[in-house]
Structure formats: structure tokens, C-alpha cells
Amino acid sequence: VEVQVSEDPVVALVDTDATLRCSFSPEPGFSLAQLNLIWQLTDTKQLVHSFTEGRDQGSAYSNRTALFPDLLVQGNASLRLQRVRVTDEGSYTCFVSIQDFDSAAVSLQVAAPYSKPSMTLEPNKDLRPGNMVTITCSSYQGYPEAEVFWKDGQGVPLTGNVTTSQMANERGLFDVHSVLRVVLGANGTYSCLVRNPVLQQDAHGSVTITGQPLTF
């Protein structure tokens, strides 16, 4: 029996359902009574789900997994993982035993899009050219950690005097705060781009300083 899985990681958004695909090639005359199937976490070998003795033994992993019972006899041993969490990320092994055995591992990559950044200025009034200002770009509830880029109005990257911090909340999602310290010109636009490296999703925020008033 040959077990096949997707070589590319499965990307799943937090709180959505994911399917970890696994298939095997049943011999002629195969019946589910002959099948033993185990899904487990590859690294810890923690049991996730199993099918044995001709029946689904159910989820051993926070009751959020399911097989596709009608498709098993065709060799579809895929696992459905419901309401994906950050902590579900990792490698899963599909082990199939009939009169032969084989296994293969599939990776689950969890992702969550970042919110549109909010921009704040300090100080935020009586600004004049030559003043040093602190611009903060904040984006929330993303995963994995973001990449943050700053540019000026001409699209020139601003790399000096940037401090970026990322903090995970209780769900494992990141809030990102990036601070740019810059000396004001006569007027200018400062843009912050927060990129999710897995989703290739960019969230943009900008602030334009034209003397008075400020526009965000």
C-alpha cells in the first residue's frame, strides 16, 4: 500500500476548517473491515484520530477532527480539522495499515490576516518642519509574525530609526506595533506596510503631514 499526501503545506485560516489530504491505493476486494488508519502529530506522535476494527474511533484531539467515511473505501484517508487554531500548526502523519503498511506526513501552516494599520503621531499638533516626530503603525490579530516596511512619499524605504515589536495574545495571534522616528520635512507622506508572509497579504496605512491639519 502506498500512502500519498500533498507535498506543499496546507494553509488554513484561523477559525476555518482545513483538510489534510491523505490517500492510499486499495487492492481489489478491499473492504473497510481490513483498514487501520491512524493520524498523529509527527513530532510528539500524539494520537489525533483513528479508524480501526471497521469503524471510526473518533477524535483524540480536542474533538475537532473527522474523517470522510463515505470516501474511505475509495482510499481517501483525509482528515478534516475544524475551527483551526494557531496551536494546530505543525506536521501530521497519516499511517495506513492493511496487509501492508505505509505512512506520510503533511504540514499544516496556520495563518490569519492582519487588520488595516492604524496610524498615530506623537506629538500630534503644532508640528513644524525640523520637528522630530514618532509615527506608530499598529496592526492586529495576524499570524504568523508580520514583516513591516516603511516608505516616504516618494516610495523610498525608511529603515533607520524603526522599532518594531510583536506580541502574541492568548490565542497566539500577533499584534504588531512599529514605530518610526523621523524629522519632518516641509510636508510629507509616511506609509507603513504590514505583510503576512504566508498569505502574501499586505495591509497599508499612511499619514500625510501638510503643516495643518494632518490627514491619515
Epitope: 500500500v1 502506498e2 487492492e27 473491515a33 481490513q34 487501520n36 491512524i38 498523529q40 506522535k45 500524539q46 494520537l47 483513528s50 480501526t52 476494527e53 474511533q57 483524540a60 499511517f95 495499515s97 492493511i98 496487509q99 501492508d100 503498511f101 505505509d102 505512512s103
Partner: antibody, heavy 118, light 110 residues
Framework: EVQLLESGGGLLQPGGSLRLSCAAS????????MHWVRQAPGKGLEWVAA????????YYADSVEGRFTISRDNSKNTLYLQMNSLRAEDTAVYYC???????????WGQGTTVTVSS | QSVLTQPPSASGTPGQRVTISCSGS????????VNWYQQLPGTAPKLLIY???LRPSGVPDRFSGSKSGTSASLAISGLQSEDEADYYC???????????FGGGTKLTVL
Amino acid sequence: EVQLLESGGGLLQPGGSLRLSCAASGFSFSSYGMHWVRQAPGKGLEWVAAINSDGSRIYYADSVEGRFTISRDNSKNTLYLQMNSLRAEDTAVYYCTKYYYHYAMDVWGQGTTVTVSS
Amino acid sequence: QSVLTQPPSASGTPGQRVTISCSGSRSDIGATTVNWYQQLPGTAPKLLIYQSHLRPSGVPDRFSGSKSGTSASLAISGLQSEDEADYYCASWDASLNTWVFGGGTKLTVL
């Protein structure tokens, strides 16, 4: 008739090497997983190693990992166990077994005796 | 130290019913199944029960198996003198990725 016939056992000193063979007949050897299981004198059964039908998936007991190598030649209907760095505790009767549904072993050879002693 | 736990010995008189237990865990018997082997003195083991309760052809129906949760048992009814042997339970352990045997139970027919 389905048969498994082990050979290659013998007496050797600690640190030595030995290769066991198991000749299979009476079934489609290339379609089945195979095992080696051993039994020390007066003791119970201990699983040693398993190999799937095409040799792409192999498992070992912790006690032999890194010292023993299971392999097969489907063109010769033969299973092998290469044993290196042998220890006194490897002394046992070694059985070759055919894999069956539900993790079972439905056919066993008569066994070959390996004695490791100085 | 075996992963599966069996009593080291059991006994009964001819005609009696004898039960041998096998205790495992969620990662072996609980997740998969259990198989039983009989080893008569001086011979190789023989598959007696597979998938917890199925008998291979040629095994008398005096032998039966069952499983509940993480434990299993082998029952022999109408005990006969030729049943005197060692009996082993076995399973696949999903947390170790190995096949595992119980320590064996020596059955004596009195």
C-alpha cells in the same frame, strides 16, 4: 502452502556481525509487509523490526535501532536482518513473520538461533 | 517491562473456561486493536485471534477474544490439555510507532 524459512543463525562473540535470511514461499511476497520477532531463552516475544512491501517504510525497536538493518529482495522472495555490534542480550531465537491485517502476524517461520557469548 | 500487561500465569481444569487479560493504553489497544498468539512448548508462535475478536481459519471456536477501551481479553472455553501453552497479546503502539507484545501468560491445564 505458505512458508517462511529462516537461516543464518549461529554462535558469535560480542561486537560481531551476522546476517539472517528468511526465504518466503506460497504467497505473493512483494505484496506484504514483513517482521522480525525474537525470543530470548525462557523469555517472552519481542518485536525487532518491520518493513513494508516495497521497503520504503521501516520501523525498529529502540533496543536494536542503529545496530540492526531490515531489508528485502522481492525478486528473491527473501527478507534479511543484518545484525551488527551484537551484544549478549541479543541472544535469542529470531522469527521471520508475515504481516497480516490489523497489525497481526499470521505466518511464522520455525526460527533461527543466535547466541552471542564470549 | 512490556507495554501491554498480562498476568504471568493462569490455570484451569479440563472443560473449564479460562480468561486471560491484556491491559494497554489509549495509544495502543485503545487506538488500534489487539491480536493474540499461542505458543505451544518448543514451537513457533501461532496467530490465534486478530482484530480483537476474529479467528483465523483452523482456530477452534473455543477461543474467543474481546476488547473494551484500553483492555482486551482472551477466553478459552472447554479447556483441553493441548491448550497448555504461552499466550501473548500484541498491538501497534501509535505513540511509539512500534509493534508491542505483552509479557505472556503461561496457561497450565491442571
